[in-house]
């Protein structure tokens, strides 16, 4: 008799999550010297741990803790580069400049993204059929208490001038319900984080509209301000030549606003 | 290049008041806080405090508050400090220094002398 | 607040030799692996010049004869070998919690 299983309203874990999370692990220490010293098995071992026959509903930080203590990580922390809506752009700008780090540049971040996982309450597997989605379901699910454990302690990780992409083309420019205006935001420290610099990517070619001025970015300038942290915001209306002009910033068309 | 220039030195009796000018170039000034920092005559470093130049907000080190006042003025790029009722005590060299939280831009100091 | 204490007050350093200045703070200044500790050097009559920010960064226009180093509570500047313009007045300061506070400064004269 097939013993009945919770159906939930998102996706179930991806396809080969074991093999994918070990690997990626043992990929990204083979390429940052810096964390070569991590055991991959037991980073699986904890990353399992925090979800396996734990109600996927129940799901705390707390259970990250032996993960985020395996894959504990010094990032330049006035090299950090937020995102929103706008992860693709993101990480095509941080392989270009290198001294440059999105969170899915740091060990924890590169074995999550884009994956998603959940277990059973009270058994050891994995389940492959679907998982809780964050709003029809619950919040305090694995993959969202991931991102939000990582995030807030990348946020709170953060010094000097912080700098975070966001997408022009959408309605909220700035989400208060993302990641970035949920949890990073709140979580940059003002004794540390001098200004946080937002760079709004244009979609349009023809689009010469300032998006700096739109609602929800000043909505994002009065958040930053009341907690004492400088806001700056530059549009940028050429994403293509924007990246074109990192790779070759010699470039005499690099010169003229983009 | 980024500069940071203060005025000239004063010379000022007790009980009077000082305002302290730094003007900055090659950078734009409400993208970084300005903080003050003091010198007495060959003693060591003091932090007073630093103002949000995008908001204007001033955070003041326990020592500076009541007398010092840190303000601004974006149309000419320039932070102010003021000091009231002078005390022999506050003859010092003035610093204003960019943020971040270290200190890699310094205006040249501004020498205030309080003697009756 | 965070107390910084500089040791020696003072040294004398002959040229091509090794000047060791350290700062101990009364806790910890490091934050997710950063270490939030800066030096500085002022000559007479100048401002503070920045040397090494964040422990071991070496400021941009500063030689490689100057180097941090420590993290926690113990940090050293080292500069090796010493040049006759190096007579100044250092001071580390640490910017991990409000308020910043500097050492009291250590005297570097050259024999």
């Known amino acids: 008799v097939p013993r009945w299983r919770q159906q939930w309203s998102g996706p179930g874990t991806t396809k080969r999550f074991p093999e994918t999370v070990l690997a990626r692990c043992v990929k990204y220490t083979e390429i940052h010297p810096e964390m070569r010293h991590v055991d991959c098995q037991s980073v699986w071992d904890a990353f399992k741990g925090a979800f396996i026959s734990k109600h996927p509903c129940n799901i705390t930080e707390e259970d990250y803790q032996p993960l985020m203590k395996l894959g504990t990580q010094t990032v330049p922390c006035n090299k950090i580069l937020l995102w929103s809506r706008i992860k693709d752009l993101a990480h095509q700008f941080t392989q270009v400049q290198r001294d440059m780090f999105t969170l899915e540049d740091t060990l924890l971040g590169y074995l999550a993204d884009d994956l998603t996982w959940c277990g059973e309450f009270n058994t050891s597997k994995i389940n492959y059929q679907s998982c809780p989605d964050w709003r029809k379901d619950c919040s305090n699910n694995p993959v969202s208490v991931f991102w939000k454990t990582v995030s807030r302690r990348f946020a709170e990780a953060a010094c000097d001038v912080v700098h975070v992409m966001l997408n022009g083309s959408r309605s909220k420019i700035f989400d208060k319900n993302s990641t970035f205006g949920s949890v990073e935001v709140h979580n940059l420290q003002p004794e540390k984080v001098q200004t946080l610099e937002a760079w709004v990517i244009h979609g349009g070619r023809e689009d010469s509209r300032d998006l700096c001025q739109d609602p929800t970015i000043k909505e994002l300038e009065s958040i930053i301000s009341k907690r004492n942290i400088q806001f700056s915001c530059k549009n940028i209306y050429r994403p293509d030549k924007f990246l074109q002009c990192v790779k070759n910033p010699e470039d005499s068309s690099c010169t003229s606003e983009i | 290049q980024i500069q940071l220039v203060q005025s000239g030195s004063e010379l000022k009796k007790p009980g009077a008041s000082v305002k302290v000018s730094c003007k900055a170039s090659?950078?734009?000034?409400?993208?970084?806080?300005m903080n003050w920092v003091r010198q007495a005559p060959g003693q060591g470093l003091e932090w007073m405090g630093w103002?949000?130049?995008?908001?204007?907000?001033?955070t003041y080190a326990d020592d500076f508050k009541g007398r010092f006042v840190f303000s601004l003025d974006t149309s000419v790029s320039t932070a102010y400090l003021q000091i009231s009722s002078l005390k022999a005590e506050d003859t010092a060299v003035y610093y204003c220094?960019?943020?971040?939280?270290?200190?890699?831009?310094w205006g040249q100091g501004t020498l205030v002398t309080v003697s009756s | 607040d965070i107390v910084l204490t500089q040791s020696p007050a003072s040294l004398a350093v002959s040229p091509g030799q090794r000047a060791t200045i350290t700062c101990r703070t009364s806790?910890?200044?490091?934050?997710?692996?950063?270490?939030?500790m800066h030096w500085y050097q002022q000559k007479p009559g100048q401002p503070p010049k920045l040397l090494i920010y964040?422990?071991?960064n070496l400021e941009s226009g500063v030689p490689a004869r100057f180097s941090g180093s420590g993290s926690r509570t113990d940090f050293t500047l080292t500069i090796n070998p010493v040049e006759a313009n190096d007579t100044a007045n250092y001071y580390c300061?640490?910017?991990?919690?409000?308020?910043?506070?500097f050492g009291q400064g250590t005297k570097v004269e050259i024999k």
């Open positions: 220094a960019r943020y971040p939280g270290w200190f890699a831009y």
């Open positions: 090659g950078y734009a000034l409400t993208n970084y806080g």
């Open positions: 103002i949000n130049t995008y908001t204007g907000e001033p």
């Open positions: 806790e910890s200044v490091d934050s997710y692996g950063n270490s939030f």
């Open positions: 964040r422990a071991s």
């Open positions: 300061q640490q910017s991990n919690e409000d308020p910043w506070t």
